[in-house]
Interface confidence: low
């Protein structure tokens, strides 16, 4: 329904607190380098303006679109040209081109300092002194570092962040109470950001149809008792929500997400038996809970798929009448029967089915042509099953750190042109699939592992898109969303790569490695491992293992030495010489 004033409509729907938080997130995601105080000032100005529109929807400028209002406000930033360079050119454009221009300049890897966690007492004092500013700062810092973070979900994180400080700053042992909660929020936040980034990439790079297919498969697995029409309605609404959030329309997105949660809870009897607890929670918790809800039980009496999709004489007629609806029904029926498959596998099966119908429905004997289509699915199903089995065995044998190292070597050999920090970050995340998924029973391993790998490989794709250095990465990232993982799995050693010249500086370490946390120390060692492979791509696993074992022993020895720095200098030279000899450099 049309509203005289869109800004007044959203302010009234969301309330002042959520309105201000969402505008802050939106601005921080667009202007990622702007100081906190500047953003707060802009948000306050927008909020004051919104209030005048609530009072009188006919007031001047209240009829303008949110993009126009927000874009005009962002373009008042005095330092736009010097801070953002060509992004300032966006301000010369009219809507909707101006907003598209801002979206194109979102930076997945902004040049921002690492967030350092202050002492617990310092944080608690800041929280008590000015709770509102403290929480706004959290929203701002997360939003600018994660420009595609799902805004309504970030409000949920902020609520938990506030709850953690409220509880723990009164506790006897503040640190013991607070630090594990903050670690959990950080890890969950990174995962949430990466999952949303894949949704936005899916919409922006592969279009609405690709996202809808993903949503049909996932919601059908989650709500197998729901009718196809019900799932279709949910998919349409969910697509609107994510399109809005990925497009920077955060007020509309949050409002529509709340409406969708309300609809699901009002109709839970026809959707899922697992929603009851979620629907008793307040709004932010409710939406989060629904998004994470476990799969409902499959109906007991589901007939064979073959009847409607292979044996029926009306297959081509039904397909021709409404291709996407028929394929959607196929995907729905297949997915609700297979919670044990990954979403990307289900989408590969649907694509194979579509390709077969396109070919066979034009053939002389269509039925004869597509009769064996389900046989084509077998190798597609077995490939991820075998891959997961092999990798879980390797993970159980090596443990997480050494499993990550195996992946580091594997991926550096596949795409050695990719920057070392990106290879380390992505391979470490790929390696976490072991701890995350291998503990599950067979029936849950594939959806856990392959859909998680899709999220991690998307991180590689968006980081690589910013500075493309490898045609192979570009190819795997752009050709097919659902075949990204098989594409990367199929890559062999890049024979065209010219090894880097050996540089002893790369393997020079200092005493400060001894004071690093275990995680940071691992990253240093893994950085050296990647650089080693870039120097000697044909090195065998055994050679690399020997060098890395020597390196670990060297770090351990020098960290125990009285004169650490001298030890690192002298033993380091010996290690480099021994490594060169071992690798034939």
């Amino acid at each position: 329904d049309a509203h005289k004033s869109e800004v007044a409509h959203r302010f009234k729907d969301l309330g002042e607190e959520n309105f201000k938080a969402l505008v802050l997130i939106a601005f921080a995601q667009y202007l990622q380098q702007c100081p906190f105080e500047d953003h707060v000032k802009l948000v306050n100005e927008v909020t004051e303006f919104a209030k005048t529109c609530v009072a009188d929807e006919s007031a001047e400028n209240c009829d303008k679109s949110l993009h126009t209002l927000f874009g005009d406000k962002l373009c008042t930033v005095a330092t736009l040209r010097e801070t953002y360079g060509e992004m300032a050119d966006c301000c010369a454009k009219q809507e909707p081109e101006r907003n598209e221009c801002f979206l194109q300049h979102k930076d997945d890897n902004p040049n921002l300092p690492r967030l350092v966690r202050p002492e617990v007492d310092v944080m608690c004092t800041a929280f008590h002194d000015n709770e509102e500013t403290f929480l706004k700062k959290y929203l701002y810092e997360i939003a600018r570092r994660h420009p595609y973070f799902y805004a309504p979900e970030l409000l949920f994180f902020a609520k938990r962040y506030k709850a953690a400080f409220t509880e723990c700053c009164q506790a006897a042992d503040k640190a013991a109470c607070l630090l594990p909660k903050l670690d959990e929020l950080r890890d969950e936040g990174k995962a949430s950001s990466a999952k949303q980034r894949l949704k936005c990439a899916s919409l922006q790079k592969f279009g609405e149809r690709a996202f809808k297919a993903w949503a049909v498969a996932r919601l059908s697995q989650r709500f197998p008792k729901a009718e196809f029409a019900e799932v279709s309605k949910l998919v349409t609404d969910l697509t609107k929500v994510h399109t809005e959030c990925c497009h920077g329309d955060l007020l509309e997105c949050a409002d529509d997400r709340a409406d969708l949660a309300k609809y699901i809870c009002e109709n839970q009897d026809s959707i899922s038996s697992k929603l009851k607890e979620c629907c008793e929670k307040p709004l932010l918790e409710k939406s989060h809970c629904i998004a994470e809800v476990e799969n409902d039980e499959m109906p007991a009496d589901l007939p064979s798929l073959a009847a409607d999709f292979v044996e029926s004489k009306d297959v081509c007629k039904n397909y021709a009448e409404a291709k996407d609806v028929f394929l959607g029904m196929f995907l729905y029926e297949y997915a609700r029967r297979h919670p044990d498959y990954s979403v990307v596998l289900l989408l590969r099966l649907a694509k194979t089915y579509e390709t077969t119908l396109e070919k066979c429905c034009a053939a002389a004997d269509p039925h004869e042509c597509y009769a064996k289509v389900f046989d084509e699915f077998k190798p597609l199903v077995e490939e991820p099953q075998n891959l997961i089995k092999q990798n879980c065995e390797l993970f159980e044998q090596l443990g997480e750190y050494k499993f990550q190292n195996a992946l580091l070597v594997r991926y550096t050999k596949k795409v050695p042109q990719v920057s070392t920090p990106t290879l380390v970050e992505v391979s470490r995340n790929l390696g976490k699939v072991g701890s995350k998924c291998c503990k599950h029973p067979e029936a849950k391993r594939m959806p856990c592992a392959e859909d998680y790998l899709s999220v991690v490989l998307n991180q590689l794709c968006v980081l690589h898109e910013k500075t493309p250095v490898s045609d192979r990465v570009t190819k795997c990232c752009t050709e097919s969303l659902v075949n990204r993982r098989p594409c990367f799995s199929a890559l062999e050693v890049d024979e065209t790569y010219v090894p880097k010249e050996f540089n002893a500086e790369t393997f020079t370490f200092h005493a400060d490695i001894c004071t690093l946390s275990e995680k940071e120390r691992q990253i240093k060692k893994q950085t050296a491992l990647v650089e080693l492979v870039k120097h000697k791509p044909k090195a065998t696993k055994e050679q690399l293992k020997a060098v890395m074992d020597d390196f670990a022993a060297f770090v351990e020895k020098c960290c125990k030495a009285d004169d650490k720095e001298t030890c690192f200098a002298e033993e380091g030279k010996k290690l480099v010489a021994a490594s060169q000899a071992a690798l034939g450099l």
């Epitope: 920057s419 920090p421 540089n503 002893a504 500086e505 400060d512």
Partner: nanobody, 123 residues
Framework: EVQLLESGGGLVQPGGSLRLSCAAS????????IGWFRQAPGKEREGVSC????????NYADSVKGRFTISRDNSKNTVYLQMNSLKPEDTAVYYC????????????????WGQGTQVTVSS
Amino acid sequence: EVQLLESGGGLVQPGGSLRLSCAASGFTLDYYAIGWFRQAPGKEREGVSCIASSGGSTNYADSVKGRFTISRDNSKNTVYLQMNSLKPEDTAVYYCAAAVLECRTVVRGYDYWGQGTQVTVSS
């Protein structure tokens, strides 16, 4: 994740000197090679000098050899570019950039960049 801030630029007469600083915040310079680049109006960004993470290895563009000296002070998390005998053709915006452990041969090999500082050599 990384912030680099250049300072020390300004207007100087031909034959004069300037010392540029590149300060890092939010990370430790120890494990990064730092390169200095410059870009004159209408020209490509070009490498000027680079120092590897340990400070043991440095390199310079032919046009600045013998006039410019790069150094690092890891305790201050800062890299310096001492520029002597400046010429009008040294006029440009000077940028520092960081790459893991070693110097790179191409501009795109650097992972992190500063915002730049203007150096103008004119009488």
